[in-house]
Amino acid sequence: KSPIFGPEEVNSVEGNSVSITCYYPPTSVNRHTRKYWCRQGARGGCITLISSEGYVSSKYAGRANLTNFPENGTFVVNIAQLSQDDSGRYKCGLGINSRGLSFDVSLEVSQGPGLLNDTKVYTVDLGRTVTINCPFKTENAQKRKSLYKQIGLYPVLVIDSSGYVNPNYTGRIRLDIQGTGQLLFSVVINQLRLSDAGQYLCQAGDDSNSNKKNADLQVLKPEPELVYEDLRGSVTFHCALGPEVANVAKFLCRQSSGENCDVVVNTLGKRAPAFEGRILLNPQDKDGSFSVVITGLRKEDAGRYLCGAHSDGQLQEGSPIQAWQLFVNEESTIPRSPTVVKGVAGSSVAVLCPYNRKESKSIKYWCLWEGAQNGRCPLLVDSEGWVKAQYEGRLSLLEEPGNGTFTVILNQLTSRDAGFYWCLTNGDTLWRTTVEIKIIEGEPNLKVPGNVTAVLGETLKVPCHFPCKFSSYEKYWCKWNNTGCQALPSQDEGPSKAFVNCDENSRLVSLTLNLVTRADEGWYWCGVKQGHFYGETAAVYVAVEERKAAGSRDVSLAKADAAPDEKVLDSGFREIENKAIQDPRLFAEEKAVADTRDQADGSRASVDSGSSEEQGGSSR
């Protein structure tokens, strides 16, 4: 499929001008190669009319130009002084005309309307409102006022001052007679339909002395705005329908066959299943404008989208609308990222999030998509050291491995963590990706005690048992804080007895805290990694209490408290508005949630290893 994209149909009127924008993937080769606009012949072939290399056909001399915008990946063809002879099938493309790197464009130039003298032209968008003004003289002030529409050869009454309304206009038309002294009546038609277009006649009086005024109503179907986005990327549709529909239900729909427009999302709570987890309808402003964000773009998302306002939350005749034609470029620079990551209940997941490599200094974020209402994505963590309170001790965003990827680790998984999460940055908004976390049945591989209590001034040893599956990987302990997980020194020696059917390759790695202080209280993680890639993690909370009896503490799996109950998320938590996702700098206020716990002094912590039987009480 050609990655070149432009308007499928361009309509204009004789004597007018058109501007045609064609999009291409902005690779180095594409930016510099020849751009052309050619007309397709009846027997195939395409005759160049204008190109970026300076060629202009005699048919276009003095009335056309082609401008390349390499930084945008677009070029624009402007054609003036259009005639009906310009109607036909064209191609805009790159390279050689016959190579196939092109897009077909149909140009239709129609004759201008043959208007009667003294005709007032009203040009109004579909779904909007028109006011047709009709002047009259004093002698007709008390006489019947009427509006007719010319249907073929005959005028058909639309509305009059005696109360008649043509059934085609019921509920959306009124006739207003201005106050005395103003010799004017007006007809207001709402929710304009394409079928309303045509020639109208206002009349005051019915005899030979009546006043008449001709009006030509042109109802414009909105030209779709062209949107060119990368596969797996993100698109935002900004919809501004005007304050008159501020309180009417809004929708975004995708045109399918014929005139059908299938609702993608609306403000009444409807959402198409194909967009679950990857769409947000951002709250509307007072002026009735709103925006819809779709991430994880797929090939099948390409097509024509309409946004509109109607009490039913779907397209109806007379809905004011805005249109887009979305093209999804399959030659994407956005890497494939996982669409699903599965984790075992009680264990962890490590999610790799791609970002634009040119923006390594951008702030990274991770949010949880919520389907309630119109979809929202409250932040859970960022790369600046903020973690949502309910996720303390079990969520970390790491800049590793870098170079276009960051890592998010979430542990202590419960069924409540299943859902859709978004990776995003405060840089390129196109690089928003969605991942679904699924919780599967199974047992965590790493075995650690539940809650552990350390005694001030004493030594604490906490075991972590690694199965043989991880024999060839680096094992570590670290202390969690809101900026990451600071590694503690580690040694790996000795098999664990915690696994059945596991050979000598299993390992017991113990964390030793010498002379425990209050600063040692907090979450500790043990885990496996390979270079900058993280595998499973397990979390232990170490509480610190006053000395009761002298000695040191050695925690075994059996002795440790049971794992704490899963945290219940507070339903009243503050949420970041979706608008902030457009500009994550707006999240700054959330940073006020400071982590008051001190970081442990790494010099007093050590990790040692040994078999289960060898775990002595003394510190080394």
Epitope: R336, P338, K342, E441, N445, Y473
Partner: nanobody
Framework: QVQLVESGGGLVQAGGSLRLSCAAS????????MGWFRQAPGKEREFVAV????????YYADSVKGRFTISRDNAKNTVYLQMNSLKPEDTAVYYC???????????????????????????????WGQGTQVTVSS
């Protein structure tokens, strides 16, 4: 949807060899990690081996390590299990399974070790074949 069809099972004497194949059709084969499981009569389904989408990472159950080899040919949409030094306790129905692997086919990101995913649990996999019987006689 992904359809998986196993073949190559049969009766073999202890110490012998068999090569199982699993042909995949449907969605992009190269996006999926492929695993083999087995189920002996009256026992639970047991993990045997798994191979990452690229073939660059493999992981085996301890009971088959050194005797079985998993491999794949993405051009043929097929995964193989070469079973050598077979034992009577290897008798079971062998199932092929596939699960979408995070990061597959990404231009910029090297793949994570397959052990870092819970691929030894049947619930990790999205699609399953019907199975092929392997019987090892003593």
């Amino acid at each position: 949807q992904v359809q998986l069809v196993e073949s190559g099972g049969g009766l073999v004497q202890a110490g012998g060899s068999l090569r199982l194949s699993c042909a995949a059709s449907g969605r992009t084969f190269s996006s999926y990690a492929m695993g083999w499981f087995r189920q002996a009569p009256g026992k639970e389904r047991e993990f045997v081996a798994v191979i990452s989408w690229s073939g660059g990472s493999t992981y085996y159950a301890d009971s088959v390590k050194g005797r079985f080899t998993i491999s794949r040919d993405n051009a043929k949409n097929t995964v193989y299990l070469q079973m050598n030094s077979l034992k009577p306790e290897d008798t079971a129905v062998y199932y092929c399974a596939s699960g979408e692997q995070p990061g597959s086919n990404r231009p910029y990101i090297p793949e994570q070790p397959i052990e870092f995913m819970p691929t030894d649990y049947p619930s990790w996999y999205d699609y399953w074949g019907q199975g092929t019987q392997v019987t090892v006689s003593s």
